[in-house]
């Protein structure tokens, strides 16, 4: 059993006669009408009326009426499709002129039920100039002078120099507040490769392969070792300033004390860390009697290693 | 090590186009910038030509400009020179090279000749 | 375009002589010259780059210095080796530009 057709819905037109032809509906598999379109549209066929068919698969064409864009005239632009039609579903290029072009940094745009998206137009775009890179021991590959957003440019450095990341050449990128980063070339020679490890301790930052001259990195001592010199180091004439020592703590632990017959004064740790400095307090444990100085049970923790005091 | 050969017909006929290739093995094309054409007449001295980045922007010698095109093929890790309308004073040896590291082709002869 | 000018053309020395090549440039072009030796039927091999700085694996016995506008190649002990002709090129501006070159035989 072939279903008939109901009657047409036709967006942006209608049957020529609708009133008396719809008592008539469904109508029978073979059936076709005449129809017309509405103003800025038209038919596959390009009229602006045509033949609807009732088909196995419904009514044929399944979209009667197609919007009609003629494109605009374009401000700031290249205007060879000025004046041409293009159908819905129709898709074309924008060529505007250089620091110009269509919002969001689209390229193209379509002939939609609605009309143009984006609508053609030409606006002035976030652009970057050459002459605001400044380039030493390099080049720039472009001949262009203005650049527009989010285009991507390569620079090369001349022989003994290189990028910070040790290349012999790199990119940037122009952005909306201007370009990515300045090209850089920096002497080979001059440049640092990793910052040296240190026993216990490790860098702030992640390392990387090359660093530029003046870079500073700065480095932490594991929990209780204690930095001594400056926590950061400098690159400078290819070689890293001295970094910092990681001093160890000093381990005060309750199986110590118990050979000593003492406890710290005031705690009841079991295990107690003391840095680099620190003066620790002692205490004979409840009937012993002190068999060092008076001095020794206030002791200090030098470089991991503390002086216990005894008592018998 | 990046090692560089040059291809191509060693006979072109005068106001024919030389075609050279420079095939990079041992190394990315994408890894340099600096991807160079030099030319020595026979007995003379050294004479750049041009170059290409791999992003493929060029610079030429002005007194070749006109005639010359030099392009990069990324996909097959090569570099190619044409040199249209040559004349006898175009025959030379063709090298390529890799100008920032100094890596060179052996170079090739191109003689234009009928 | 920066013309670049080489003397002398030729020069002829004994293994052991220091030998000076001075190459000039039409305007100033910072340290940005190489040196070059091409040995007859062989390929060009750049000795110094950066006007002063020694190309990995050359010996020491070559040198370069100047700055913007001359500048010398300097073989400091001659080697049977070293007889070849030399060529200085900028790379300061484009388009790159090389001496005429400088032919060094046996005496």
């Known amino acids: 059993q072939v279903k008939p057709c109901d009657f047409p819905d036709i967006k942006h037109g209608g049957l020529f006669h609708e009133n008396m032809r719809r008592p008539y509906f469904p109508v029978a598999v073979g059936k076709y009408y005449s129809y017309y379109c509405d103003e800025h549209f038209e038919t596959p066929s390009g009229s602006y009326w045509d033949y609807i068919h009732c088909t196995q698969n419904g009514w044929s064409p399944a979209v009667p009426c197609l919007r009609k864009c003629y494109f605009p005239y374009l401000e700031n632009g290249y205007n060879q499709n000025y004046g041409r039609k293009f159908v819905q579903g129709n898709s074309t290029e924008v060529a505007c002129h250089p620091g110009y072009g269509l919002p969001k940094a689209q390229t193209t745009v379509t002939c939609t039920e609605k009309g143009w998206s984006p609508t053609p137009r030409c606006i002035r775009v976030r652009t970057c100039s050459k002459s605001d890179i400044e380039i030493e021991n390099g080049f720039i590959s472009e001949s262009s002078s203005i650049y527009i957003l989010n285009k991507e440019i390569q620079y090369k450095c001349k022989p003994g120099y290189a990028t910070a990341d040790g290349n012999s050449s790199g990119s940037i990128t122009c952005l909306q507040n201007g370009w990515s980063a300045q090209p850089i070339c920096i002497n080979s020679s001059e440049k640092c490769g990793p910052p040296p490890p240190i026993s216990n301790g490790d860098t702030t930052s992640f390392l990387l392969k090359v660093y530029v001259p003046q870079s500073r990195v700065e480095y932490q001592c594991q929990p209780y070792y204690e930095l001594q010199g400056s926590n950061y180091v400098t690159c400078s004439n290819g070689e890293w300033s001295e970094p910092p020592r990681c001093i160890h703590p000093c381990i005060i632990t309750e199986e110590n004390m118990n050979k000593n017959n003492i406890k710290l004064k005031g705690r009841s740790d079991r295990k107690y860390y003391a840095k680099t400095g620190d003066t620790i307090e002692f205490m004979c444990k409840l009937g012993y009697n002190a068999n060092t100085s008076i001095l020794s049970f206030q002791a200090v923790c030098r470089e991991g290693i503390v002086e216990y005091p005894r008592c018998e | 090590q990046v090692q560089l050969q040059e291809s191509g017909p060693g006979l072109v006929k005068p106001s024919g186009t030389l075609s050279l290739t420079c095939a990079v093995s041992?190394?990315?094309?994408?890894?340099?910038?600096?991807w160079t054409w030099v030319r020595q007449p026979p007995g003379k001295g050294l004479e750049w030509i041009g170059e290409?980045?791999?992003?493929?922007?060029?610079n030429y010698n002005p007194s070749l400009k006109s005639r010359v095109t030099i392009s990069v093929d990324k996909s097959k890790n090569q570099f190619s020179l044409k040199l249209s309308s040559v004349t006898a004073a175009d025959t030379a040896v063709y090298y390529c090279?890799?100008?920032?590291?100094?890596?060179w082709g052996q170079g090739t002869l191109v003689t234009v000749s009928s | 375009d920066i013309q670049m000018t080489q003397s002398p053309s030729s020069l002829s020395a004994s293994v052991g002589d220091r030998v000076t090549i001075t190459c000039r440039a039409s305007?100033?072009?910072?340290?940005?010259l190489g040196w070059y030796q091409q040995k007859p039927g062989k390929v060009p091999k750049r000795l110094i780059y950066?006007?002063?700085s020694l190309q990995s694996g050359v010996p020491s016995r070559f040198s370069g210095s100047g700055s913007g506008t001359e500048f010398t190649l300097t073989i400091s002990s001659l080697q049977p080796e070293d007889f070849a002709s030399y060529y200085c090129?900028?790379?300061?501006?484009?388009?790159?530009?090389l001496g005429p070159g400088t032919k060094v035989d046996i005496k």
């Open positions: 950066a006007a002063s």
């Open positions: 090129l900028q790379y300061n501006n484009y388009p790159f530009t």
């Open positions: 041992g190394g990315s094309i994408s890894s340099s910038n600096w």
């Open positions: 290409t980045y791999h992003d493929g922007s060029t």
């Open positions: 090279l890799e100008f920032y590291f100094d890596y």
């Open positions: 305007q100033d072009i910072r340290n940005d």
